[in-house]
Interface confidence: low
Amino acid sequence: KESCDVQLYIKRQSEHSILAGDPFELECPVKYCANRPHVTWCKLNGTTCVKLEDRQTSWKEEKNISFFILHFEPVLPNDNGSYRCSANFQSNLIESHSTTLYVTDVKSASERPSKDEMASRPWLLYR
């Protein structure tokens, strides 16, 4: 039987290489059973994670999984850094692994690092 605890599926050490000026969506995959938890995004600043309260977010629902999305419209150079999503569930705070955005300024686009979204084998969710 599957656990009914809320789970946040951000992979450890995940990272995205993105270009300043582009739109981007940062996904926090959330698994829950009955009631959708309250989820927030924060940006790491040293040892603290600063809550992103004034940013555009949305939910995308799929079967068996939902996504809490942080929108970058567009990506700015100072969006570079590490982010974490957290869920409040039955008075418990569940935190995801951090995910890092590497933002390359348009002016130096030719030097943009070519990082694949995932270097290791794919993790098959249902297969």
């Epitope: 599926y9 992979k11 995940s14 990272e15 995205h16 582009d22 739109p23 981007f24 969506e25 996904e27 995959p29 799929e62 079967k63 068996n64 999984i65 996504f67 995910t99 694949d116 979204e117 995932m118 794919p122 993790w123 098959l124 969710l125 249902y126 297969r127």
Partner: antibody, heavy 124, light 107 residues
């Protein structure tokens, strides 16, 4: 081993209906979307729609609304597509295809397992 | 609905050559793109998923690239078994439309 076995060829008259099947094995049928795709001779692939067998929820390409009806039977791990009011334009090979997911630094989708294809010929 | 514009429609090439097929989405699809190969009378086969990841068993001469609205499939050193039709497909919200296809023929 994941497999999708489709029903045999159909020869049907214009105006009639046909129901083709796709039997899945080797994976959790009820918790994975099943897609249907049309291929006409000399034409490209067209996405018809998909069904989630767990609860019967379906999404359709607007072009096929009213033409195709998707259903699924969890007990037999079989997906069905009924095509109605058939015309020569519906003569094609129809494929079912299982939708997979992977997780990198985001979720992504793809059709990784395909059925053998069912040929439907509409002729008087 | 998102439209996928695939080019070229056909290519006539020799074994050993390199080819690139492109797909343009009508809006940002955030790498939610797959590439398939289909041979005459056969079922399509997944080649690349999430724009850049090779499916199991696909030779390394195939590679996918792109982001945003522009994506491409590159085949290095074409082999005789690579001839057939190629399609892109987006997964950025239903309907999951395909590109119009590229037919790869032997010169």
């Amino acid at each position: 081993q994941i497999q999708l076995q489709q029903s045999g060829p159909e020869l049907v008259k214009p105006g009639a209906s046909v129901k083709i099947s796709c039997k899945a094995s080797g994976y959790a049928f009820s918790s994975s979307w099943m897609n249907w795709v049309k291929k006409r001779p000399g034409k490209g692939l067209e996405w018809i729609g998909r069904i989630y067998p767990g609860d019967g929820d379906a999404n359709y390409n607007g072009k096929f609304k009213g033409k195709a009806t998707l259903t699924a039977d969890k007990s037999s791990s079989t997906a069905y597509m009924q095509l109605s009011s058939l015309t020569s334009e519906d003569s094609a090979v129809y494929f079912c295809a299982g939708e997979g997911h992977y997780y990198g630094s985001g979720y992504r989708w793809y059709l990784d397992v395909w059925g053998t294809g069912t040929t439907v010929t509409v002729s008087s | 609905d998102i439209q996928m514009t695939q080019s070229p429609a056909s290519l006539s090439v020799s074994v050993g050559e390199t080819v690139t097929i492109t797909c343009r989405a009508s809006e940002n699809i955030y790498s939610n793109l797959a590439w398939y190969q289909q041979k005459q009378g056969k079922s399509p086969q997944l080649l690349v998923y999430a724009a850049t990841n090779l499916a199991d068993g696909v030779p390394s001469r195939f590679s996918g690239s792109g982001s945003g609205t522009q994506y491409s499939l590159k085949i290095n050193s074409l082999q005789s078994e690579d001839f057939g039709s190629y399609y892109c497909q987006h997964f950025r919200g239903a309907p999951f439309t395909f590109g119009s296809g590229t037919k790869l023929e032997i010169k």
